[in-house]
């Protein structure tokens, strides 16, 4: 139990969010971080994994409504599966209908997240900024 | 002490953020919420105050770097003082130099926050979305 050393009391009118890696954004008990350095999709995925996180997974417009105001384009954890035509997340789950508008802008098998729940198809080797996400239990 | 009823243990490798009002964004122990409904500056201020918060105050590019990726324009707590020509926050503090680029788009005494630390001057009676902020102790 040596890793645990903080004991806090929380007022019922407010709540703590997390736990998250230090200096990450916490929202509705999910942790998010935006990374400025441009990497390709695979490097972005590796960077998130090295921080016990994954690339952004969009699973709910309600729980993730902070994403609608995100500026610019960032890698998320969505990839195209050529053999069945579906889009799936890193965890193997299939993209739910009506969650993202997939925009056919570039020829590629990865997707960039853009504001208002849009996903722009992009070549996986193109460098871009990226969003990591860690779901709290 | 009746309002306090949760006791949590936090791993040193991660941390909790807050406390914040329920479902607000927590980042570096500040709480933020984006409101979709358009209100004039005074109504926006009143809305934030009713939630024990104030309109957004920008005080640090480092501590508030999440703001650089915010899309669109939102009321913040910055007002122009005609008598001395300065811009000040709701708490009376003066806008620090080099924190915001003030852009004179409209004639007005209030300011909208826009991505990359820009402030757009706007008429205080114009309806806009707004950002509330609560600084944790």
């Amino acid at each position: 139990n040596s890793l645990f050393n903080q004991e806090v009391q929380i007022p019922l009118t407010e709540s703590y969010c997390g736990p998250c890696p230090k200096n990450w954004i916490c929202y509705k008990n999910n942790c998010y971080q935006f990374f400025d350095e441009s990497k390709n999709w695979y490097e972005s995925q590796a960077s998130c994994m090295s921080q016990n996180a994954s690339l952004l997974k969009v699973y709910s417009k309600e729980d993730q409504d902070l994403l609608k105001l995100v500026k610019s384009y960032h890698w998320m954890g969505l990839v195209h599966i050529p053999t069945n035509g579906s889009w799936q997340w890193e965890d193997g789950s299939i993209l739910s209908p009506n969650l993202l508008t997939i925009i056919e802008m570039q020829k590629g098998d990865c997707a960039l997240y853009a504001s208002s729940f849009k996903g722009y198809i992009e070549n996986c080797s193109t460098p871009n900024t990226y969003i990591c996400m860690q779901r709290t239990v | 002490n009746s309002l306090f009823n949760q006791e949590v243990q936090i791993p040193l490798t991660e941390s909790y953020c807050g406390p914040c009002p329920k479902n607000w964004i927590c980042y570096k122990n500040n709480c933020y919420q984006f409101f979709d409904e358009s209100k004039n500056w005074y109504e926006s201020q009143a809305s934030c105050m009713s939630q024990n918060a104030s309109l957004l105050k920008v005080y640090s590019k480092e501590d508030q770097d999440l703001l650089k990726l915010v899309k669109s324009y939102h009321w913040m707590g910055l007002v122009h003082i005609p008598t001395n020509g300065s811009w000040q926050w709701e708490d009376g503090s003066i806008l620090s130099p080099n924190l915001l680029t003030i852009i004179e788009m409209q004639k007005g005494d209030c300011a909208l926050y826009a991505s990359s630390f820009k402030g757009y001057i706007e008429n205080c009676s114009t309806p806009n979305t707004y950002i509330c902020m609560q600084r944790t102790v």
């Epitope: 195209h80 050529p82 053999t83 069945n84 035509g85 579906s86 889009w87 009506n98 508008t101 925009i103 056919e104 802008m105 020829k107 590629g108 098998d109 208002s116 849009k118 198809i121 | -």
Partner: antibody, heavy 121, light 107 residues
């Protein structure tokens, strides 16, 4: 890369017809195949699409109402459109089309030559 | 379903003219709009995808713009081979829908 269509012709009202489209020069089982029709002197109307791979996922226009069925044969690199209970309103040129890239499903840069279906007694 | 309204339905123009065709969607389609050219007896040909991206091999006199619900196809200097019918198509969501078409005729 091309799409070669077959199967059009004259059919009586109430009859059925199967239109097919063979893809060559590309990996058929990684692409969506779409069908679009155009009545004489009218505009383009999307019918539906099917994925050429193992899933065979389909989407249809809301007006189709089960009269049209999409299928595909991976081994033959062929997509087909079965049209049942034909009426005069189904008289049209029928096109198959393929998206510009395998991850696309809604933007078409490769088209078949079209096949005419005439419904008349 | 998303309705696509194209205007005008036909227009007469001369070689060298600048031609503008508009397309309005019944809801925001997030720049997911394609433009096709069709000549009599031929299959449609993709000109512009994602509202403003020029398809490979298409002359640069064709351009697309727009966002939200309103989109425009512009031919900067009409050439003899451009007399045809033009269709917009929303690529935002299934079911896919086309505009009614704009026939560009010789004045």
């Amino acid at each position: 890369q091309q799409l070669e269509q077959s199967g059009g012709g004259l059919v009586t009202p109430g009859g059925s017809l199967k239109l097919c489209c063979i893809g060559s020069g590309f990996d058929f089982n990684t692409y969506w195949m779409t069908w679009v029709r155009q009545a004489p002197g009218k505009g383009l109307e999307w019918i539906g699409c099917i994925h050429g791979g193992s899933s065979g996922s389909t989407y249809y226009a809301s007006w189709v109402n089960g009269r049209f069925t999409l299928s595909r044969d991976i081994d033959q690199s062929t997509g087909c459109l079965q049209v049942n209970s034909l009426t005069a309103a189904d008289t049209a040129m029928y096109y198959c089309a393929r998206p510009g890239y395998r991850s696309w499903s809604k933007t078409f840069d490769l088209w078949g030559q079209g096949t005419m279906v005439t419904v008349s007694s | 379903d998303i309705q696509m309204t194209q205007s005008p339905s036909s227009l007469s123009a001369s070689v060298g003219d600048r031609v503008t065709i508009t397309c309005r969607a019944s809801q925001d389609i997030s720049e997911s709009l394609n433009w096709y050219q069709q000549k009599p007896g031929k299959a449609p040909k993709l000109l512009i995808y994602a509202a403003s991206s020029l398809q490979s091999g298409v002359p640069s006199r064709f351009s697309g713009s727009g966002s939200g619900t309103d989109y425009t196809l512009t031919i900067s200097s009409l050439q003899p081979e451009d007399f045809a019918t033009y269709y917009c198509q929303q690529a935002n969501s299934f079911p896919l829908t086309f505009g009614g078409g704009t026939k560009v005729e010789i004045k």
